[in-house]
């Protein structure tokens, strides 16, 4: 079976939510909080491979772990999977779970799962809680707006 067209080059971005929380890993889970002192070095950059026109793959750790949307029964959850972002293909059906649709609004960006329509990448209002997915982006319970800045 053909593997499908590989995606374009990976770029590193800094991401933080509109409450200024940055991402870091805790027990192999992606968490958002206010890092301080020497812990600021734990901040996870987001590795991005764009897919035309507004979709992208999202990874961390130099693209060695990727964010995906997984449905299991009634549960929809964000998962970190140990796959290489540059091995993903926009044309492979099984890679769709790694794709997110980027929507920009002024200086902020939202990320909707392509495989789980209506589910958005989010953080909790409280610090040091897992990054997750919500299907209620306008309820104000979870934060779905992010600042997304190409890393220098």
């Amino acid at each position: 079976r053909p593997s499908g067209r590989k995606s374009s080059k990976m770029q590193a971005f800094r991401i933080w939510d509109v409450n200024q929380k940055t991402f870091y890993l805790r027990n192999n889970q992606l968490v958002a909080g206010y890092l301080q002192g020497p812990n600021v070095n734990l901040e996870e950059k987001i590795d991005v491979v764009p897919i035309e026109p507004h979709a992208l793959f999202l990874g961390i750790h130099g693209g060695k772990m990727c964010l995906s949307c997984v449905k299991s029964g009634d549960e929809t959850r964000l998962q970190l999977e140990a796959v290489n972002i540059t091995d993903l293909s926009e044309n492979r059906k099984q890679d769709k779970r790694f794709a997110f649709i980027r929507s920009d609004s002024g200086p902020t960006t939202s990320f909707e799962s392509a495989a789980c329509p209506g589910w958005f990448l989010c953080t909790a209002m409280e610090a040091d809680q897992p990054v997750s997915l919500t299907n209620m982006p306008d309820e104000g319970v979870m934060v779905t707006k992010f600042y997304f800045q190409e890393d220098e």
Epitope: G106, P107, K145
Partner: antibody
Framework: QVQLKESGPGLVAPSQSLSITCTVS????????VHWVRQPPGKGLEWLGV???????HYNSALMSRLNISKDNSQSQVFLKMNSLRTDDTAMYYC?????????????WGQGTTLTVSS | QAVVTQESALTTSPGETVTLTCRSS?????????ANWVQEKPDHLFTGLIG???NRAPGVPARFSGSLIGDKAALTITGAQTEDEAIYHC????????VFGGRTKLTVL
Amino acid sequence: QVQLKESGPGLVAPSQSLSITCTVSGFSLTSYGVHWVRQPPGKGLEWLGVIWAGGVTHYNSALMSRLNISKDNSQSQVFLKMNSLRTDDTAMYYCARGGALLRSHFDYWGQGTTLTVSS
Amino acid sequence: QAVVTQESALTTSPGETVTLTCRSSTGAVTTSNYANWVQEKPDHLFTGLIGGTNNRAPGVPARFSGSLIGDKAALTITGAQTEDEAIYHCALWYSNLWVFGGRTKLTVL
């Protein structure tokens, strides 16, 4: 263009409460944070607190027990409330926008409102 | 709470390069303190110049630049102009709060 404008009571008696409103235009409070900063006469700036775009607030720890910051996104207004006022709270009070770049803050400022705490 | 200190006053001449610094009581200033620099002109006119250590705010002339020099944050004005005479404030970020320094009165003679 981006504008912020503070409005306050001017004169407040000691032990009373203060309420200042910052009305913004040219940007959305759902995309940018707003800081409150004050400057006592002849002194430097003192950061009071911030309300981020997502609604979370952070405060100067020395003033936290007396401060409350809130906002109304639809009215483009941010509110500073401060209780148990003392004479050393006499200052110019400013609101300032927090920029969208990471921690790139205080890019636009209001013209300030004078607060005098005196009996 | 951390204490942030700046030079109280500096004097320069038009066309010269001048550097203002910002020191933290907690140790070396790093990029994680996201130093911000704000200019204050008469009649309470404040303008953000630099954010995030070295990001120039929109519309700020290129002669203003931010950096880290040694253990301090720095604002350098390359080719100072008479209109740069003002008070300059720096602010440093400590996890989830900002602390302003004293202030530096810059005279351009």
